[in-house]
C-alpha cells in the first residue's frame, strides 16, 4: 500500500496515569492515540507484552476500543503479583509507533495482622497513659485512629494526642478507663487491633494521718491512719525505719496502731505506709514517752575531814533527761551543772549532777538537797555532810571477806559471802552486772551478815556479782563471777576461815618518797595457813572514797607502793592469798604522808621547764573499749619539748553507784609514748579521761576530757 498524503504516524494524546488500586477492584489505565490509519494499541508491563481478552477471552484484562486497558479485578497475592508493575501503551500504524509515558500500577494492600497490638495499661490517676500501636503492613501506609469502648476518640480534646501510632492521655482520670482499639486504615479498608484495657487506679492518699503524741510511761497511745485508693491500699507500720518489734503493738481493723502500756523504748518515729500497685505513701508521727525522774544514784550521808574534798553523787534518769540542781537546806542559793564557778565558791555541779565541795569547812556541815525536775515530775533526795577534825578522818568500809568466783549447777544454791566492817558500820548491798540485785526475785535474799543467797539456780543467774559496803565515810566493793551450768556443784563451798591464811600483821612504813611508800609486814600468826602471795590496798581521802588495790601477787613481805601523790596522806592494809582465797585484812597502817614536791634539780631552769610544759598541747583521741574492763587511750602532741618525762593518764568514774570525783592516774613514763591501756575498769560504766604531760614535779596543761562507757558482758545462757 502506498503512502497517502493525509496519513500520519501515531501520537499519544492521552497518557496513562499512575494508579493505586485495591486488590480485587476494577481499574483502568487510559491511553488514547491519534494517527492515520487508526493505530493499533498494545500494552506492555515491565517490558513484556500484556495478555488481554484479545489473546484469551477468559483474561481479567480487557483492551477497550479507546485503547485503554481495563482490569475487571486486580489480581494480587502474597507472592504472585501479575498486575502490579510499570505499564506503557504502544500505538502503531504503518508509519511508525508511539510509546506513552510509564504509568505504575500499585496494588493497595492492608494486611490483617497488626505489627504491634496495643497492650493493657495500668496507670495511676493523674499520670499519663500511653497506648502503642503499629498498624498492619499496607500500601499506601495505613493511618490509625483509636476507639474507646467502640466509639471513635476525638483527639481534639487537649488531654489526648495521637502521634505516630501512640495514643497519649496526658492526665488520666477514672473515666478514661475502658477498652481501647487501634484502627488501621487505608484505601483497602479498616482493620481493628485486639482491644487493650486501660485501668486507671488511684494511688493511696491519706484521709487521716497519724499525729505526733506525747504520753507518760505506762499510758496507752493510738496512732490513727486512714487511707483511700484503688485498689484498696495495704497498710503497714514501721518504727524508726524498721519493722515493728513483735508483741508490743496491736493493729486494729482500721489500721490504728495501739500501744497498751508505753515504755521509754517505744519512743521514736512511727510511719504508716499505704501501698497499692500504683503508688506508695508514707505518713509519720513521733511518739515521745515521758518518764518521771528517777534516781540512778542517790546522794548518801558523808563524814569528811576539814580541808578535804567531798562529792555527793546524784545521777538521775527520765524522759526528758531531768534537770538537776542542788541547794543546801536553809539556803536560797541554787547550784546548777555547767554553771560558771563563782569566785571564792568551793561548790560545783558536774554535768552528770554530782555536787563537789572542795576545801571543806565546818560551816559546810548540813543537809544537801538534790532535786531533779522535768515536765513529767520532780524528785528530791537529801544527804547529810558531817565535818570532822582531820585527826578523826575515817576510812571507807573494809570488806573483811568478799564473794569468791564459783561454778554451780542448775537448781543448786549459791552463797556469795560479804562481811564488812567500818565506822560507822557499813550497809551491804549487791549488784549483778552493775545493776541493783536481787530486786523482786524471791529466790534471792541478803542474809544478816550480808551474804547473798540464790536458790534454785538458773543458767540466767550466771554473771558478775558485786558486794558494795557503804557508809558515810565511803564505799568499798568486791566482785565475783557466778557461773551456772548443768554440771556444776549443787551448793557453794562455804570456806571456813581455817581454810584461809591468817591476816598479816599491821604494815610498817620503812621508806617514803614523794611518789612511793615502802611497807613491810609479817605473815599471819603461827598456826594459820601459809600465804602464797599478798595484795596491798590503799586509801586516801583526797584521792578516792574507796579502798583501791595498789599491788597484786606480791611475793615478799617488803614492797614499795609507787604512783602515789606527793604530799598526800595514805592508809594501807595487806591481805594474804592462798588457793582457797583471801585472808581478812591486816590492821591498818598508821597514816603516812608522802613527801612534798622537792625544789627543782640543779642545772634545770624550772621557769623554762614550766614555760615549755605550758606550751605542750595534748590532743586526746576517742578512747576505744577493748574489753568490758579495759580501754585504750591514745593521744597526739603538737609540740614535743625537751623537758618532758612522760604523760599522766587521768581517769575517773562518772556513772554508777561508785561515781566519784577523784581521779585515778596511770603514768606513761616514756616521753615518746602516745598510748596507754586502762585495766581493771568496771563494766557498763562511764569514765572521764584526760592526759597531762609532766617533768619531775612540773605538770603541763590537761588535754580536753573524753568520756567512754565500758561494755556490759551479757550473761552466758
Amino acid at each position: 500500500s502506498r503512502l497517502r498524503q493525509e496519513d500520519f504516524p501515531p501520537r499519544i494524546v492521552e497518557h496513562p496515569s499512575d494508579v493505586i488500586v485495591s486488590k480485587g477492584e476494577p481499574t483502568t489505565l487510559n491511553c488514547k492515540a491519534e494517527g492515520r490509519p487508526t493505530p493499533t494499541i498494545e500494552w506492555y508491563k515491565d517490558g513484556e507484552r500484556v495478555e488481554t481478552d484479545k489473546d484469551d477471552p477468559r483474561s481479567h484484562r480487557m483492551l477497550l476500543p479507546s485503547g485503554s486497558l481495563f482490569f475487571l479485578r486486580i489480581v494480587h497475592g502474597r507472592r504472585s503479583k501479575p498486575d502490579e508493575g510499570s505499564y506503557v501503551c504502544v500505538a502503531r500504524n504503518y508509519l511508525g509507533e508511539a510509546v506513552s509515558r510509564n504509568a505504575s500500577l500499585e496494588v493497595a494492600l492492608l494486611r490483617d495482622d497488626f505489627r504491634q497490638n496495643p497492650t493493657d495499661v495500668v496507670v495511676a490517676a493523674g499520670e499519663p497513659a500511653i497506648l502503642e500501636c503499629q498498624p498492619p503492613r499496607g500500601h499506601p501506609e495505613p493511618t490509625i485512629y483509636w476507639k474507646k469502648d467502640k466509639v471513635r476518640i476525638d483527639d481534639k480534646e487537649e488531654r489526648i494526642s495521637i502521634r505516630g501510632g501512640k495514643l497519649m492521655i496526658s492526665n488520666t482520670r477514672k473515666s478514661d478507663a475502658g477498652m481501647y482499639t487501634c484502627v488501621g486504615t487505608n484505601m483497602v479498608g479498616e482493620r481493628d487491633s485486639d482491644p487493650a484495657e486501660l485501668t486507671v487506679f488511684e494511688r493511696p492518699t491519706f484521709l487521716r494521718r497519724p499525729i505526733n503524741q506525747v504520753v507518760l510511761e505506762e499510758e496507752a497511745v493510738e496512732f490513727r491512719c486512714q487511707v483511700q485508693g484503688d485498689p484498696q491500699p495495704t497498710v503497714r507500720w514501721k518504727k524508726d525505719d524498721a519493722d515493728l518489734p513483735r508483741g508490743r503493738y496491736d493493729i486494729k481493723d482500721d489500721y490504728t496502731l495501739r500501744i497498751k502500756k508505753t515504755m521509754s523504748t517505744d519512743e521514736g518515729t512511727y510511719m504508716c505506709i499505704a501501698e497499692n500497685r500504683v503508688g506508695k505513701m508514707e505518713a509519720s508521727a513521733t511518739l515521745t514517752v515521758r518518764a518521771p525522774p528517777q534516781f540512778v544514784v542517790r546522794p548518801r550521808d558523808q563524814i569528811v575531814a576539814q580541808g578535804r574534798t567531798v562529792t555527793f553523787p546524784c545521777e538521775t534518769k527520765g524522759n526528758p533527761q531531768p534537770a538537776v540542781f542542788w541547794q543546801k537546806e536553809g539556803s536560797q542559793n541554787l547550784l546548777f551543772p555547767n554553771q560558771p564557778q563563782q569566785p571564792n565558791s568551793r561548790c560545783s555541779v558536774s554535768p552528770t549532777g554530782d555536787l563537789t565541795i572542795t576545801n571543806i569547812q565546818r560551816s559546810d556541815a548540813g543537809y544537801y538537797i538534790c532535786q531533779a525536775l522535768t515536765v513529767a515530775g520532780s524528785i528530791l533526795a537529801k544527804a547529810q555532810l558531817e565535818v570532822t577534825d582531820v585527826l578523826t578522818d575515817r576510812p571507807p568500809p573494809i570488806i573483811l571477806q568478799g564473794p569468791a568466783n564459783q561454778t554451780l549447777a542448775v537448781d543448786g544454791t549459791a552463797l556469795l559471802k560479804c562481811k564488812a566492817t567500818g565506822d560507822p558500820l557499813p550497809v551491804i548491798s549487791w549488784l549483778k552486772e552493775g545493776f541493783t540485785f536481787p530486786g523482786r526475785d524471791p529466790r534471792a535474799t541478803i542474809q544478816e551478815q550480808g551474804t547473798l543467797q540464790i536458790k534454785n539456780l538458773r543458767i540466767s543467774d550466771t554473771g558478775t556479782y558485786t558486794c558494795v559496803a557503804t557508809s558515810s565515810s565511803g564505799e568499798t566493793s568486791w566482785s565475783a563471777v557466778l557461773d551456772v551450768t548443768e554440771s556444776g556443784a549443787t551448793i557453794s563451798k562455804n570456806y571456813d576461815l581455817s581454810d584461809l591464811p591468817g591476816p598479816p600483821s599491821k604494815p610498817q612504813v620503812t621508806d617514803v618518797t614523794k611518789n612511793s611508800v615502802t611497807l613491810s609486814w609479817q605473815p599471819g600468826t603461827p598456826g594459820t595457813l601459809p600465804a602464797s602471795a599478798y595484795i596491798i590496798e590503799a586509801f586516801s581521802q583526797s584521792v578516792s572514797n574507796s579502798w583501791q588495790t595498789v599491788a597484786n601477787h606480791v611475793k615478799t613481805t617488803l614492797y614499795t607502793v609507787r604512783g602515789l601523790r606527793p604530799n598526800t596522806i595514805y592508809l594501807f592494809m595487806v591481805r594474804a592469798i592462798n588457793p582457797q582465797g583471801l585472808s581478812d585484812p591486816s590492821p591498818m597502817s598508821d597514816p603516812v604522808r608522802t613527801q612534798d614536791i622537792s625544789p627543782p634539780a640543779q642545772g634545770v631552769d624550772h621557769r623554762q621547764v614550766q614555760k615549755e610544759l605550758g606550751d605542750v598541747l595534748v590532743r586526746l583521741h576517742n578512747p576505744v573499749v577493748l574489753t568490758p574492763t579495759t580501754v585504750q587511750v591514745t593521744w597526739t602532741v603538737d609540740r614535743q619539748p625537751q623537758f618532758i618525762q612522760g604523760y599522766r593518764v587521768m581517769y575517773r568514774q562518772t556513772s554508777g553507784l561508785q561515781a566519784t570525783s577523784s581521779w585515778q592516774n596511770l603514768d606513761a613514763k616514756v616521753p615518746t609514748e602516745r598510748s596507754a591501756v586502762l585495766v581493771n575498769l568496771k563494766k557498763g560504766v562511764t569514765y572521764e579521761i584526760k592526759v597531762r604531760p609532766y617533768f619531775n614535779e612540773f605538770q603541763g596543761m590537761d588535754s580536753e576530757s573524753k568520756t567512754v562507757r565500758t561494755t556490759e558482758e551479757a550473761p552466758s545462757a
Epitope: 486488590k23 508491563k45 515491565d46 513484556e48 507484552r49 500484556v50 495478555e51 489473546d55 484469551d56 486486580i74 489480581v75 494480587h76 497475592g77 502474597r78 507472592r79 504472585s80 503479583k81 501479575p82 498486575d83 490483617d112 495482622d113
Partner: antibody
C-alpha cells in the same frame, strides 16, 4: 489458553539426579510464582518449593534444602526442577503449579513420573 | 512450620448426601486456606481459595468456611463425579493437609 506442560517420565538410579521441565503458555510467565509439588504412590501432596520467574528467587522447605534446585528460562517461559542424590523414596509424580494472585495453585501441569530404582 | 490436620482421612457417602470435611491449622492462618480436589491419575484441581471464595468454573454445591485455625469444606449434595480425594492447603507456608478420601457407600 493458560496451560503448563511438563516433560516425560524418568527412571533413575539411586544417587543420580533428575531435571523436570515445565513450559508455561497463555499468560505472562514472569507475573506468577511457579511451585513444585510431588505425590508418592498412594500418598498425599507434598510442597517442594517455589521460584519467582521474574528474578529467579527461590524458597524451599527445610526437607529439600541442599538437594533441590529450581531455575527458569524466561525466553522460553519454562521452569525447571532439579533433584539430586535420588533415593528410592523420591519415587513420585512431580507437578508444577502456578500460584494465582489469590494465593492458590490455580493451574497445574499434568505431572511427571520419576521412578528411582536400582 | 504450620501443620495442617485433616479429618476424617476417609469417609463413605451416598449421592445426594451432605458431606463435611474439616481442616485444622496448628496456629492461626487467618483466611489463607485453599481446598483442592484430586481424582486418581489426575493433577489436583483448585476448588476454594481464601477459605471461602469459589474458584471460577467450580459448581456452587462446594463451599468453604472458617478462619484462624478451623476450616470446613462442605459438599451440599454429593454427585457421582465428586468421589475423589480432597486436600486443604495453607497459603502462608504452602503445606498441604493429609487428605480426605470420599468413597461411595
Amino acid at each position: 489458553q493458560v496451560q503448563l506442560v511438563q516433560s516425560g517420565a524418568e527412571v533413575k538410579k539411586p544417587g543420580a539426579s533428575v531435571k523436570v521441565s515445565c513450559k508455561a503458555s497463555g499468560y505472562t510467565f514472569t507475573g506468577y510464582y511457579m511451585h513444585w509439588v510431588r505425590q508418592a504412590p498412594g500418598q498425599g501432596l507434598e510442597w517442594m518449593g517455589w521460584i519467582n520467574p521474574k528474578n529467579g528467587d527461590t524458597e524451599f522447605p527445610q526437607k529439600f534444602q541442599g538437594r533441590v534446585t529450581m531455575t527458569r528460562d524466561t525466553s522460553i517461559s519454562t521452569a525447571y526442577m532439579d533433584l539430586s542424590r535420588l533415593r528410592s523414596d523420591d519415587t513420585a509424580v512431580y507437578y508444577c503449579a502456578r500460584e494465582s494472585g489469590d494465593d492458590a495453585f490455580d493451574i497445574w501441569g499434568q505431572g511427571t513420573m520419576v521412578t528411582v530404582s536400582s | 512450620d504450620i501443620v495442617m490436620t485433616q479429618s476424617p482421612s476417609s469417609l463413605s457417602a451416598s449421592v445426594g448426601d451432605r458431606v463435611t470435611i474439616t481442616c485444622r491449622a496448628s496456629q492461626s492462618i487467618s483466611s489463607y486456606l485453599n481446598w483442592y480436589q484430586q481424582k486418581p491419575g489426575k493433577a489436583p484441581k483448585l476448588l476454594i481459595y481464601a477459605a471461602s471464595s469459589l474458584q471460577s468454573g467450580v459448581p456452587s454445591r462446594f463451599s468453604g468456611s472458617g478462619s484462624g485455625t478451623d476450616f470446613t469444606l462442605t459438599i451440599s449434595s454429593l454427585q457421582p463425579e465428586d468421589f475423589a480425594t480432597y486436600y486443604c492447603q495453607q497459603s502462608v507456608g504452602l503445606f498441604f493437609g493429609g487428605g480426605t478420601k470420599v468413597e461411595i457407600k
